[in-house]
């Protein structure tokens, strides 16, 4: 049977139906992909340009393949099995009235069905299956895949990868509230914040008094101690860790194969021997890399280092003096760690708004 030979897939909504708000269409496809990612190890990332594995489009009649749409009713959509080019793509008949309710044709339900084909599923003869060839309305808010659907998709891709549990090692390092405590790297990981130091990291939920500690090797045996920079792209469940001239990708708390990779593949010049700190700004969709007195800016959409970088930190981040140990993005602010202190920085107004102890996150 046809299936994708990789876990991380991209999709792009090439055009939008005028029947619905763009943001509703985006949300519906995000949720439709999530239906399948919830029961498999597959992960989906939305592209805004270029060719994606799964291209989604709305079209009337003839639209570039042999399978012309037939006007309102009849064929609602079609999708191709996995593979390059048109394969994997999902086409929706614009002659239908697409909705997010029981009226017209519910886009979410048809999307889940068509994306099933895009992932390699055939039609089912079980009327309870979303892969049954006849459309019928179900309430999207209570929608669940049938046992048949789960069994069929897992026969292609397996069950979801369980994230490893974060456990406390037997001998935690001593107290947080030590005056001179500094961190190697700090980043969010989902709802938690990870504070890396030497061979271990502390992690905690903001606002919760509990602090946990885990050795890096106990959760990720392939990741070295002494991580120097880290950032998270939460929308993709991706965590990037840096040490010297290498970086690692952790997906859903599971290290990706074929890593580490060279930092030079990201566009750094040969003069860069290590990254001091890194932070992803989700509003700008940029990663800021801090290296000595300079910083570099990386565009995650284009997967390219922005031109005209590096630039001086002191010029473009007023009030920030090198050298930087770690940077955390939290609630639209950057928290810039330098030794025993951290600066709360507002990137919108480009100014430092607070000076705090590095350990303030632990109630110190």
């Amino acid at each position: 049977r046809s299936r994708w030979m990789k876990r991380y897939l991209t999709y792009r909504i090439y055009n939008y139906t005028p029947d619905m708000k763009r943001e509703d269409v985006d949300y519906i496809f995000q949720k439709a992909f999530q239906v399948w990612s919830d029961v498999t190890p597959l992960r989906f990332r939305k592209l805004h340009k270029d060719e994606a594995d799964i291209m989604i489009l709305f079209a009337f009649g003839a639209h570039g393949d042999f399978n012309y749409f037939d006007g309102k009713g009849g064929t609602l959509a079609h999708a191709f099995y996995p593979g390059p080019g048109i394969q994997g793509d999902a086409h929706f008949d614009e002659a239908e009235t697409w909705t997010k309710s029981f009226q017209g044709t519910n886009l979410f339900l048809v999307a889940v069905h068509e994306l099933g084909h895009s992932l390699g599923l055939q039609h089912s003869n079980n009327p309870k299956s979303i892969m049954y060839p006849t459309y019928r309305y179900l309430n999207p808010s209570t929608f669940r895949l049938s046992a048949d659907d789960i069994r069929n998709i897992q026969s292609l891709y397996g069950a979801p990868v369980k994230p490893p549990s974060l456990t406390k090692p037997s001998s935690p390092p001593s107290t947080f509230c030590h005056q001179s405590l500094s961190f190697d790297a700090v980043t969010t990981v989902g709802e938690k914040i990870f504070f890396f130091k030497d061979w271990f990291f502390w992690w905690k939920l903001p606002g919760s008094p509990a602090t946990n500690i885990t050795s890096i090797s106990s959760i990720w045996p392939s990741i070295p101690s002494g991580i120097q920079a880290a950032y998270e792209i939460e929308s993709r469940n991706q965590l990037f860790l840096f040490k010297d001239e290498k970086y690692w990708l952790i997906n859903n708390l599971v290290p990706e194969p074929h890593y580490p990779r060279s930092i030079y593949s990201l566009g750094f010049s040969a003069s860069v021997k290590k990254v001091d700190a890194a932070v992803f700004d989700p509003l700008r969709q940029k990663v800021y890399f801090f290296v000595d007195k300079h910083y570099w800016r990386y565009d995650v959409r284009q997967e390219l280092m922005d031109p005209a970088y590096p630039k001086l930190i002191s010029t473009h981040f007023p009030g920030i003096k090198p050298k930087i140990d770690a940077v955390l993005y939290f609630k639209r602010h950057y928290y810039i760690f330098q030794g025993a202190y951290q600066l709360e920085y507002d990137p919108l107004f480009r100014r430092v708004t607070k000076t705090l102890k590095s350990t303030s996150w632990f109630g110190c």
Partner: antibody, heavy 122, light 103 residues
Amino acid sequence: EVQLLESGGGLVQPGGSLRLSCAASGFTFSWYNMSWVRQAPGKGLEWVSRISPSGGDTGYADSVKGRFTISRDNSKNTLYLQMNSLRAEDTAVYYCAKDIRGAYSSGLFDYWGRGTLVTVSS
Amino acid sequence: DIQMTQSPSSLSASVGDRVTITCRANQSIYTYLNWYQQKPGKAPELLIYAASSLQSGVPSRFSGSGSGTDFTLTISSLQPEDFATYYCQQAGIFGQGTKLEIK
């Protein structure tokens, strides 16, 4: 290695019939859409007909509709084109071409046979 | 019905030249455009699919771009073996072909 080998071409009089075959090997034939494409002497390429993996769905160019019939025998890994009521303008090299997997045909022809020449002349 | 217009119909160039062939659809075909190369007496060979994806085994001097209605095939530095006829295609519609000849 994917191989497509056409046969059955030849000289036929206007109004006559001919059946072309395409023997496929090197891939799971029953999974793939297949097409016939032709090329008149000194002219460009013209798509003729397509068929789904099961044989249940077919399509034809307007120029051959009602006269040509595409079929397949998955047990023999063979594609066919039955050509009736042949005309002088059907003179061409006929190629069979492998399309993508699955229920729908795309016209992405990644492998072609060497072709077989059909000449319609009195 | 969708129609494909390819230009130029013929083109003379020299080894080492950069060559561009264009293909235009009369309505959007998104990125569903393929390019084929055909040498005399031979079957066509797939070069580019989905407008810009290079078929396995095809030299990197060939590239494709475009989406919607306008597409191009570019050969960055012509080699002697590139002199052939090139066709754009989507589903059952082929362009008229571009014959690339040695100047």
